[in-house]
Structures are given as C-alpha cells and as structure tokens.
Interface confidence: medium
C-alpha cells in the first residue's frame, strides 16, 4: 500500500511540474503551444490562486473571530488549598500550592485571603471547610463557615452560611462543610470565608479548599 | 456632620511603637470601610493601610506590611493604628480616612495627628 501511495504521490507531483512550465512556456510565448490552451491553462491557475488566497482568508478570518470570542470571554477559574495561619483572624488563608488553579490575571489571590475577580459575571463559588472540634473543649456555640463577598464600595456581605455542632469523640470529630453557590460579581469584587474558629480547620490535603468558576 | 479626630502621635525613637486611634462620628461607623493615610515633610499623601466595614479584611501598603497593624472597634466607632518597629522614613502625619469604596478611595479626612520617629 505504502508503495502504491508513493507512485501516486510521485504521479501528482509529475503532473504538477508539467502544468507549471507549460505556464512557463505560455508565459514566455512559445509557438508551439496553442492561444485557446494558454488561456485555458491561465485561468485554471488563477483558479486555483483564487480558491488559496480565499482558504487563507477564510482561516484568518476564523482564527480572529475565535481570538475575540476567547477575549470576550476568557476561563476564569481558581482554585486554592488552606494554609494554617499564626493569626488570630477569622478569614481564613489560603495559597496557591499543591493542585491548585488560577487561571489567568482576571482572578488573583489577595493577601493570601480573598480571591478577586476582574470581570463582571455569573461566578459558581465553593469552598470546603474541614474541622475537627469537640463538645466540651469547644463552647456552646457551633462551628460556623461564612462565604462572604466584598465588593468595591459596598460592606462585606455573608453569601452563604452553615452550621455543624461539635462532635463528642476525642481528642476531636472531624467534619467538613461544603457551601456553593452563583452569584452576580462586580469587577473588583473579592470572596473569602470566614469561620468562627480559625485553630479547629484541618489543613490537611484535599481538606480545606476555595475557589470559583466564571460560567 | 462627619468629624473624624485623631489621636496618638507623638515623638518616638526608632524600633519604637504607637497606637493611633480615630474617634468617628456623624455617620454610621460599622457601614464604611476605613483607613490611615500619611504625608512626610514636603512629600506627597501616601496611602498605608484600609480595613474594611466589619473589620474582617485589612491592606496594608508594602512600606508598613508586617510593622503596622489596623483594627477597628465597631461597638466604640473607633479606628486604630498599631505602628511597631518604626523608622525614620515613617516620621508623617497621619490622617483617619473614611471611605466610600475601595481599598484607597476616601472622601472625609480628619485633622491629622504627627508622628515623629527620631532619636
């Protein structure tokens, strides 16, 4: 088979170089070949100019439009892994390390807390928090994780919330918390989580982790 | 009326420490986020920290990152500062800024109170 290809190729190619210097030939006006067939065999050639130079065309033209339409809209997505922090704050931290995702500058980890969107849009925003408490080291209250927003101009807002008790094994239960959720964000909008106590989250991996998706 | 009064500033030696506090009135307190902004000697304003409305995001400009700490008392309507381990290049006066957004965007100031880091 492969020989068969190679002798059709070597054919093809033959026949190739006998149009091109017939239209050589034509070009420099030799006698022996007719005017009805110069003319035929020109505007064969310019055909087949046209129809390279229109697929060039189309191809650019494809290849701009999927350029704008992937700069109108991008994949912005992140996603980032906990990180134990000597602060005493609520907020909790976060780092781009280990599996992590951040997709290109329309969305940034600031201050190693909140995660800040460039563009206007529908965003899914998650995060899972993993802790591990116990009833009676703990006070009465529950373990509380806070999605919350902050948009420029605006106070922060608490998007999302939830609630586990503490758990009586010893030395502590391990439990995690999942919140979701879209939402509208402005350009410049940040997201962070917050938690009523920052030293009970396990920092583990694949424990504790934050991120978004633009859909 | 928005009044914002600082108070705090002082002479201090380098590597020394000061607390600033702002006392704010006139408007609701726990609704804005709020900041400290300072002017050297024949400098320009220079922004150093924001903290936001409830107090659970702060910023802080690279020159005071680590030495400088910003807090706010929502039940007090009272903003603070804690400078540590000051310098020389921090010698300024420092207003109390309320802001209606964004982390150096502000439109009241207060009076301004000086801090003077010499030996």
């Known amino acids: 088979h492969r020989r068969l290809d190679k002798i059709e190729d070597e054919r093809n190619l033959h026949e190739d170089f006998v149009f091109m210097k017939t239209i050589q030939r034509c070009n420099t006006g030799e006698r022996s070949l007719s005017l009805l067939n110069c003319e035929e065999i020109k505007s064969q050639f310019e055909g087949f100019v046209k129809d390279i130079m229109l697929n060039k065309e189309e191809t650019k033209k494809e290849n701009s439009f999927e350029m704008q339409k992937g700069d109108q809209n991008p994949q912005i997505a992140a996603h980032v892994i906990s990180e134990a922090s000597s602060k005493t704050t609520s907020v909790l931290q976060w780092a781009e390390k280990g599996y992590y995702t951040m997709s290109n500058n329309l969305v940034t980890l600031e201050n190693g807390k909140q995660l800040t969107v460039k563009r206007q849009g529908l965003y899914y925003i998650y995060a899972q928090v993993t802790f591990c408490s116990n009833r009676e080291a703990s006070s009465q209250a529950p373990f509380i994780a806070s999605l919350c927003l902050k948009s420029p101009g605006r106070f922060e807002r608490i998007l999302l919330r939830a609630a586990n008790t503490h758990s009586s094994a010893k030395p502590c239960g391990q439990q995690s918390i999942h919140l979701g959720g879209v939402f509208e964000l402005q350009p410049g909008a940040s997201v962070f989580v917050n938690v009523t106590d920052p030293s009970q989250v396990s920092h583990g991996t694949g424990f504790t982790s934050f991120g978004l998706l633009k859909l | 009326e928005v009044q914002l009064l600082e108070s705090g500033g002082g002479l201090v030696q380098p590597g020394g420490s000061l607390r600033l506090s702002c006392a704010a009135s006139g408007f609701t307190f726990s609704q804005y986020d709020m900041g400290w902004v300072r002017q050297a000697p024949g400098k320009g304003l220079e922004w150093v920290s924001t903290?936001?409305?409830?107090?659970?995001?702060?910023y802080y400009a690279d020159s005071v990152k680590g030495r400088f700490t910003i807090s706010r008392d929502n039940s007090k309507n009272t903003l603070y500062l804690q400078m540590n381990s000051l310098r020389a290049e921090d010698t300024a006066v420092y207003y109390c800024a309320k802001g209606p957004g964004g982390r150096r965007r502000f439109d009241y100031w207060g009076q301004g109170t000086l801090v003077t880091v010499s030996s």
């Open positions: 903290i936001s409305s409830r107090g659970w995001l702060t």
